[in-house]
């Protein structure tokens, strides 16, 4: 056979044996002559081995550019391709020679010991075991062990070719440690050399360092870094590390394979770098590389080495945090330190513990901030090794958008008697206080809930044309008083009042308060009636279980058919500030009540009595009267609030105190509850009696002991009692100093 590309004038070298394949017997002589048109050379099988001494290449005696190859006493191993070629070209002629050696049908490899076949477990891959034959038509099978298995050519994916070897899908022999070819000749078995099976994987999925980041140590400590490589199966791994002092004498490297669950398609390798006494020069980037030969992956982490343990606050640590009620507040403790400090938070000196509303850790988190969270928060960092402490104060200011106190109490409509002077009030609580409170108004008929007006939750008022109260043309004459500031329920509030000098026109009034974090508004329905008048007997809000009467008084000559109703649930829920349907136009929402009629010379009085009032009795009560002439109905509405019974509680500054003889003691004991409790004082469990030295004021709320004496020392108890029980607080008063014995001194006694 000829190979190579023909050049312009050169013919291929010509062999004396004009065949592609030559079969000869062992121990005979092989001789082939090659002739050509320029310098020739021969290549033969195994021509890099020691068998070269047996091969003779000689110049022909009968001409130029001719060489004869001679091998006396050929053996099976001489089987292979013999190539004659022109020097420095690809022009060559080849003959494949089989040396039939029935005692050695397989050509031995150069090493003659064993071969290696590399395979992957890929289902689609085939592997060739290079057991070449010295005879072309052998019956060859492949033996794999252990366990022993034999594979026979199947005319498909398993085959044997004398020039190539045994081809088989690689996964079939991936279990085996070794394979060899076997040929049967006249019932004799002949084996090739052994081939060791090496299953190769190469893929590294990832390389992970642990700890992966934020590694900090101080001089002298031990650094332990783990590097884990996850790979496919049948992979070998080389690890290498790169780090600042690679020449470290205290360094230790341990590499090992990690056990993985059987059936896992993954293998894990671990390399551990240990530096026993770390120094400042060891600070820097540590990189671990894992390599299988075909794939390398690496990962890095920074190791920071401190001279000694320390703790300090970071520059970003805030001193003032501002928030609005309801927000989530996060105050991070920004620190520098090694090791990480213990962090403790305090509010106004009291330790904070985590619960469902507050998380006190590296970050102080207040889930939904409220006013009571305002204050000074101290964070104390403690270095766990050196016990060094650092503290920092953060002031939390919680802003409150304007809240209008009356808003929560507002009834749908209260009625106002025609011609009367009325005061409308908006009590605003806001932090910071509102920078303005403005009043607006609108005529009632311009803003009635007609069916044509769509009332929605987002826009509860169908009226949009609010006018400033300065422009009261067509309405009631108005005067806005200067805002006042009042301490109400312990809170500083801004009170804005609007005085309607004569209630002539039904209107709506709106107060609007604005501060830096929001706005609040209240709409007041100012319904003016010439109709009946409602009064409350007694004229105060009743408490549960008390009795109250609602009186409806109407001029007998003008009105008839007085009836009491209670306003039931509205067809639409009443949103704060939303205007209800005018009561008289919608009797469906009214429940008729039983009442008693009385008369005097000019008026009819319809009395509706509530004995034993309960919280369920709260609501809007409507007195309806009919005009005798026009038959037009007139309604008056009164909101009734029933106060809940509350057991006594005490607030105030009753605390243990030490006083010198002759000084005064002033303490207060503020009690709340409904009905209001009675306050009593005791000294050493005996009732405290007022005398010239002991003064009780403001319903016993305030106790003053003038010119105290030694005998005034003792346990003082303030007790607040009502029908619902008692509450008490105690304090011990210590009196210091020597008693001066003087006749002029006033003595007071109490038992």
């Amino acid at each position: 056979a000829s190979v190579g590309l023909p050049s312009v004038s050169l013919d291929l070298p010509r062999l004396s044996i004009q065949k592609d394949i030559l079969t000869i017997k062992a121990n005979t002589t092989l001789q082939i002559t090659c002739r050509g048109q320029r310098d020739l050379d021969w290549l033969w099988p195994n021509n890099q081995s020691g068998s070269e001494q047996r091969v003779e290449v000689t110049e022909c005696s009968d001409g130029l550019f001719c060489k004869t190859l001679t091998i006396p006493k050929v053996i099976g191993n001489d089987t292979g391709a013999y190539k004659c070629f022109y020097r420095e070209t690809d022009l060559a002629s080849v003959i494949y020679v089989y040396v039939q050696d029935y005692r050695s049908p397989f050509i031995a490899s150069v090493s003659d010991q064993h071969g290696v076949v590399y395979i992957t477990e890929n289902k689609n891959k085939t592997v060739v075991i290079p057991c070449l034959g010295s005879i072309s038509n052998l019956n060859v099978s492949l033996c794999a062990r252990y366990p022993e298995k034999r594979f026979v050519p199947d005319g498909n994916r398993i085959s044997w070719d004398s020039k190539k070897g045994f081809t088989i899908p690689s996964y079939m022999i991936s279990y085996a440690g070794m394979v060899f070819c076997e040929a049967k000749i006249n019932d004799e078995s002949y084996q090739s050399i052994m081939y060791i099976v090496v299953v190769v994987g190469y893929r590294i999925y990832d390389v992970v360092l642990s700890p992966s980041h934020g590694i900090e140590l101080s001089v002298g400590e031990k650094l332990v870094l783990n590097c884990t490589a996850r790979t496919e199966l049948n992979v070998g791994i080389d690890f290498n590390w790169e780090y600042p002092s690679s020449k470290h004498q205290h360094k230790k490297l341990v590499n090992r394979d990690l056990k993985t669950q059987s059936g896992s398609e993954m293998k894990k390798f671990l390399s551990t770098l240990t530096i026993d006494g770390i120094t400042r020069s060891d600070q820097g980037l540590y990189t671990c590389a894992a390599s299988s030969g075909l794939m390398t992956k690496k990962n890095s982490t920074f190791v920071r080495v401190h001279e000694k343990p320390f703790v300090a606050f970071g520059s970003g640590m805030e001193s003032l945090v501002e928030a609005t009620v309801g927000e989530r507040v996060r105050i991070p403790a920004k620190y520098l330190g090694y090791p990480p400090p213990e962090i403790k938070w305090y509010k106004n000196g009291i330790p904070l513990e985590s619960n469902h509303t507050i998380k006190a850790g590296h970050v102080l988190t207040i889930m939904e901030v409220s006013e009571r969270d305002t204050g000074n928060y101290t964070v104390i960092l403690t270095n766990p090794i050196s016990k060094e402490k650092q503290s920092h104060v953060v002031s939390l200011v919680v802003y409150v958008p304007p809240q209008i106190g009356e808003k929560s109490l507002i009834s749908p409509v209260d009625s106002y008697q025609y011609g009367t002077t009325q005061t409308l009030t908006c009590t605003v609580y806001a932090i910071p206080p509102p920078h303005h409170i403005h009043w607006y108004w609108q005529l009632e008929e311009e803003c009635a809930n007609e069916p044509s007006h769509a009332v929605s939750v987002t826009n509860p008022y169908p009226c949009e044309e609010w006018r400033s109260v300065e422009d009261f043309q067509g309405g009631n004459k108005i005067e806005v008083n200067k805002n006042q500031f009042a301490l109400i329920e312990g809170k500083n509030k801004t009170v804005s009042t609007l005085v309607i000098q004569a209630a002539n026109v039904s209107a709506l009034y709106k107060c609007e308060a604005v501060n830096k974090v929001g706005r609040g508004e209240r709409v007041i329905s100012f319904h003016v009636t010439r109709g009946p008048e409602i009064t409350l007997q007694p004229d105060m809000q009743p408490t549960e279980q008390e009795s109250v009467s609602l009186w409806c008084t109407a001029d007998r000559s003008t009105f008839e058919n007085l009836t009491w109703y209670k306003l039931g649930p509205q067809p639409l829920p009443i949103h704060v500030g939303e205007l209800p349907t005018p009561v008289c136009k919608n009797l469906d929402t009214l429940w008729k009540l039983n009442a008693t009629m009385f008369s005097n010379s000019t008026n009819d009085i319809l009395i509706m009595e509530l004995k034993n009032a309960s919280l369920q009795d709260q609501g809007d009560y409507v007195c309806l009267a009919q005009d005798r002439k026009t038959k037009k109905r007139h309604c008056v509405v009164r909101q009734l609030t029933v106060l809940e019974r509350v057991a006594p509680t005490i607030t105030g500054n009753l605390e243990n105190q030490t006083t010198s003889i002759g000084e005064s003691i002033e303490v207060s004991c503020t009690a709340s509850g409904n009905p209001p409790p009675q306050i009593m004082w005791f000294k050493d469990n005996e009732t405290l009696v007022e005398d010239s030295g002991i003064v009780l004021k403001d319903g016993n709320r305030n106790l003053t002991i003038r010119r105290v004496r030694k005998e005034d020392e003792g346990l003082y108890t303030c007790q607040a009692c009502s029908v619902l029980g008692c509450a008490k607080v105690e304090a011990f008063f210590i009196i210091e100093g020597a008693q001066e014995k003087t006749n002029l001194e006033h003595h007071h006694h109490h038992h």
Epitope: T120, N122, N124, K125, V200, Y202, R203, Y205, G236, I237, D238, F239, N240, E242, T287, A289, A290, S291, S292, G293, L294, M295, T296, K297, K298
Partner: antibody, heavy 117, light 112 residues
Framework: EVQLVESGGDLVKPGGSLKLSCAAS????????MSWVRQTPDKRLEWVAS????????YYADSVEGRFTISRENAKNTLFLQMNSLKSEDTALYYC??????????WGHGTTLTVSS | DVMITQDELSNPVTFGESVSISCRSS???????????LNWFLQRPGQSPQLLIY???TRASGVSDRFSGSGSGTDFTLEISRVKAEDVGIYYC?????????FGSGTKLEIK
């Protein structure tokens, strides 16, 4: 700057041997897998051999298995390719390449091997 | 071994235009980790190959965003937008899904 400089290419007779070297600089040699890739006269690229960072694991193309040996000397930042029983089909421009994540991210300029009698 | 096929020449392109170079694999290069192990190299005249794209579509460090890779499991495309003179050379694709890693025969970028 990463640099890979190959050397050792020559004209060799078929059956002969040759050793190629690749000097690396500008990076930590011992942290990268290294490979040899050759480019035949018809401009085809063929992967030849690869070696792991410590030199424990080597891989070869079937065409050179048993004839070529890849090795490295990390202390000298040098990669080697020992080539025996050379054939005319080994004639090529031999590149050494740096490998990370299986990718050859830097290549040398190559050294030429010609196998011819 | 996995065979990688490439056209010898690209469609002729004028500077400033876009061009697509294709590459086909005899087997899917989508590995079980969900990544597609196909790389693109450019060999400029007289230079050594340079990695452009790895994992089918990730640009190598310092490579212009004019180069983008896409494809399915077996069919891949390298797109070069606004072609410049420096883009001239042979483009090779290479598979890394199965050992031995094999290269395509290369596609020469042809300029009109």
């Amino acid at each position: 700057e990463v640099q890979l400089v190959e050397s050792g290419g020559d004209l060799v007779k078929p059956g002969g041997s040759l050793k190629l070297s690749c000097a690396a600089s500008g990076f930590t040699f011992s942290m990268y897998g290294m490979s040899w890739v050759r480019q035949t006269p018809d401009k085809r690229l063929e992967w030849v051999a690869s070696i792991s960072i410590g030199g424990s694991y080597t891989y070869y193309a079937d065409s050179v298995e048993g004839r070529f040996t890849i090795s490295r000397e990390n202390a000298k930042n040098t990669l080697f390719l020992q080539m025996n029983s050379l054939k005319s089909e080994d004639t090529a421009l031999y590149y050494c390449a740096r490998e990370m994540d299986g990718n050859y991210d830097y290549w040398g300029h190559g050294t030429t091997l010609t196998v011819s009698s | 071994d996995v065979m990688i096929t490439q056209d010898e020449l690209s469609n002729p392109v004028t500077f400033g235009e876009s061009v697509s170079i294709s590459c086909r694999s005899s087997k899917s290069l989508l590995y079980k980790d969900g990544k597609t192990y196909l790389n693109w190299f450019l060999q400029r005249p007289g230079q050594s190959p340079q990695l452009l794209i790895y994992l089918m579509s990730t640009r190598a460090s310092g490579v212009s965003d004019r180069f983008s890779g896409s494809g399915s499991g077996t069919d891949f495309t390298l797109e070069i937008s606004r072609v410049k003179a420096e883009d001239v050379g042979i483009y090779y694709c290479q598979q890394l899904v199965e050992y031995p890693f094999t290269f395509g025969s290369g596609t020469k970028l042809e300029i009109k």
